[in-house]
């Protein structure tokens, strides 16, 4: 999946099995990503777990759990909110669209939480003080998660210069810049282009990551996906001067 | 392993604070330079650590793109007091405290927040 | 909780080969560099060697190097110790511990050199 | 490679009362960078070795803060405030600093 880190960073991630999203005092996300095609490097996340540790007089312990084809409003006892506790309403979930959108709030910790299911894969974006981010205590265990650190070199696709490639060669000769066995249905470069450019009409990293995606799956449900995360920055992201993340002028290999 | 508090102090430095450092300035070189020294202080105890080889390579990585020179300036971390986390002896009929910003905000201004979001493939 | 379960010890003769596993679980053992530590009867601890988590760099001591070797399969979350041309003075409990300094030990498995 | 001697090797304590146990090295553990890699270890009888303090004086996560590390170049010294019938066993200085890794000898701690 694309990633943007605690710091802007804008990473394309080949990470597959469960990984550490986020991992802190008060709160530990965990996603499962698999291949997008059998034997691609390309992964999407189908699986997303949330557990909200106990705090003070707040909440209990409370898990929600999201799968793909399964967003439910609530959490996996059953309840809504943070428990019987007496501020079990600082903790909170709301269904925005049934089976496809929901928020969850977390006012204990300043924190809002975006889960979608976009197409057959789930996304994720949240919003959270500096200050819960940095409450690891134990900097050992705690702490190498992909939000904060980013995925691990030897994880990551160069999907720019991929989208670099794909523009230069055109569609026929694709799958040799592709990370991933090209898909069965996939696009033109043109057709892909086109179809973000609707979304998504500013040319940054959200835009490029729609025009990776749909040329390596084919999956137009990935238009929407770059679209919402997008979205979902505008709504979550403090400093509106961020919203769009560009490319790095850099060399490329093969160019001059 | 200390590596990881390297890379907060790396996050702490750059991120929103009332004067960030930003990707384009020399702060952010500094703040960059200073994650490095603390990486090779982590070397002898962190080598072997994917975190310690993440860092080193996000470094290089990050130095090369923002032509960083390995010489000059580096950046002090600036110092946080964490919430309290679990389970507290102290009880409170105060709603406050579980209303991060309520309670922020009698120590601080406004807390600094940060966005991470994961998508597509 | 961290684990780590050694196996593999026992009787030897002295010049012969014996293959020690060590089952890690309760952390993310491909983070990690991972070290074989040994300690003869009523002795003192000696360290024995590292690898890195990713297999790039293997660091051995003196006593060991060349005939011992330390390998993982991050996908088994399992560390080995393959020890060829056995002595009697490496008789002793031997001990995985994860990081690249140790911080958690297994319980230890007991080899015996002795003709 | 780098020696460290311990001493005494067995020390006797009455339950209650401090103990101190000292490492010297054959050289200096401090970095370039002003940092030291020491640790100490402790070894109940028939179990495993224990993290108990590193980089000189840091206690790792779970250790009593009776614990506690302090020195610097070559000597260190650990020290137990108040010596309880848990802490019998035996205790090991390591380095991290220069390869390769090597231990003490041990000191064994006793209850009189």
């Known amino acids: 999946p694309h990633l943007r880190t605690f710091t802007d960073r804008f990473q394309t991630c080949k990470v597959q099995g469960a990984w550490p999203l986020i991992d802190n005092n008060y709160l530990n996300v965990q996603v499962t990503n698999t291949p997008v095609l059998p034997g691609s490097a390309a992964t999407a996340t189908s699986k997303l777990t949330i557990i909200f540790k106990n705090f003070q007089e707040c909440v209990d312990q409370k898990v929600y759990q999201a799968e793909m084809d399964e967003l439910p409003a609530a959490f996996v006892d059953g309840s809504k909110n943070g428990g019987d506790k007496h501020g079990a309403n600082s903790l909170k979930i709301t269904e925005k669209v049934s089976g496809q959108h929901v928020e969850i709030q977390a006012k204990y910790i300043g924190t809002t939480i975006v889960v979608r299911q976009v197409g057959r894969y789930l996304t994720f974006a949240v919003r959270m003080p500096e200050e819960v981010v940095n409450a690891v205590e134990d900097w050992d265990s705690q702490g190498l998660y992909l939000c904060l650190r980013g995925c691990p070199l030897n994880q990551q696709i160069d999907f720019q210069a991929f989208h670099t490639n794909a523009e230069g060669t055109g569609a026929r000769r694709l799958a040799a810049a592709s990370p991933a066995p090209t898909a069965p249905e996939t696009f033109p470069y043109e057709t892909a282009v086109a179809k973000c450019k609707e979304k998504l009409p500013v040319e940054d990293l959200y835009y490029q990551a729609c025009v990776f995606d749909l040329l390596t799956t084919g999956d137009v449900n990935f238009t929407l996906a770059a679209y919402y995360a997008l979205e979902d920055v505008k709504m979550l992201h403090s400093n509106k001067d961020k919203l769009h993340l560009y490319e790095r002028t850099r060399d490329l290999p093969g160019r001059a | 392993c200390k590596i990881l508090k390297c890379n907060s102090e790396f996050w702490s430095a750059t991120s929103g604070s009332h004067a960030p450092a930003s990707d384009d300035t020399p702060e952010f070189c500094a703040a960059l330079r200073s994650y490095a020294l603390c990486t090779r202080r982590t070397a002898r105890t962190c080598r072997g650590d994917l975190a310690y080889h993440s860092a080193v390579h996000g470094i290089e990585d990050l130095m090369s793109q923002h032509n960083c020179s390995k010489d000059g300036p580096t950046s002090q971390p600036r110092l946080r007091t964490l919430p309290p986390a679990g389970d507290s002896q102290e009880r409170s009929d105060s709603p406050e405290i579980c209303h991060y910003e309520k309670s922020f905000h009698k120590h601080s201004a406004t807390p600094n927040y940060t966005h991470c979001g994961l998508f597509g493939d | 909780e961290v684990q780590l379960v050694e196996s593999g010890g026992g009787l030897v003769q002295p010049g012969g080969s014996l293959r020690l596993s060590c089952a890690a679980s309760?952390?993310?053992?491909?983070?990690?560099?991972m070290n074989w530590i040994r300690q003869a009867p009523g002795k003192g601890l000696e360290w024995i060697g590292m690898i890195y988590y990713d297999s790039s760099e293997k660091h051995y001591a003196d006593s060991v190097k060349g005939r011992f070797t330390i390998s993982r399969d991050n996908s088994k979350n399992t560390l080995y110790l393959q020890m060829n041309s056995l002595r009697a003075e490496d008789t002793a409990v031997y001990y995985c511990?994860?990081?690249?300094?140790?911080?958690?030990w297994g319980q230890g498995t007991m080899v015996t050199v002795s003709s | 490679d780098v020696v460290l001697t311990q001493s005494p090797l067995s020390l006797p304590v009455t339950l209650g009362q401090p103990a101190s146990i000292s490492c010297r090295s054959s050289q200096s553990l401090e970095t370039s960078d002003g940092d030291t890699f020491l640790e100490w270890f402790q070894q109940r009888p028939g179990q495993s070795p224990r993290l108990l303090i590193y980089e000189v004086s840091t206690r790792f996560s779970g250790v009593p803060d009776r614990f506690s590390g302090s020195g610097s170049g070559t000597d260190f010294t650990l020290k137990i405030s108040r010596v309880e019938a848990e802490d019998v066993g035996v205790y090991y200085c390591?380095?991290?600093?220069?390869?390769?890794?090597?231990f003490g000898q041990g000191t064994k701690l006793e209850i009189k």
């Open positions: 511990a994860k990081g690249t300094t140790p911080d958690y």
């Open positions: 309760g952390f993310t053992f491909s983070n990690y560099g």
């Open positions: 390591f380095q991290v600093t220069h390869d390769p890794m090597t």
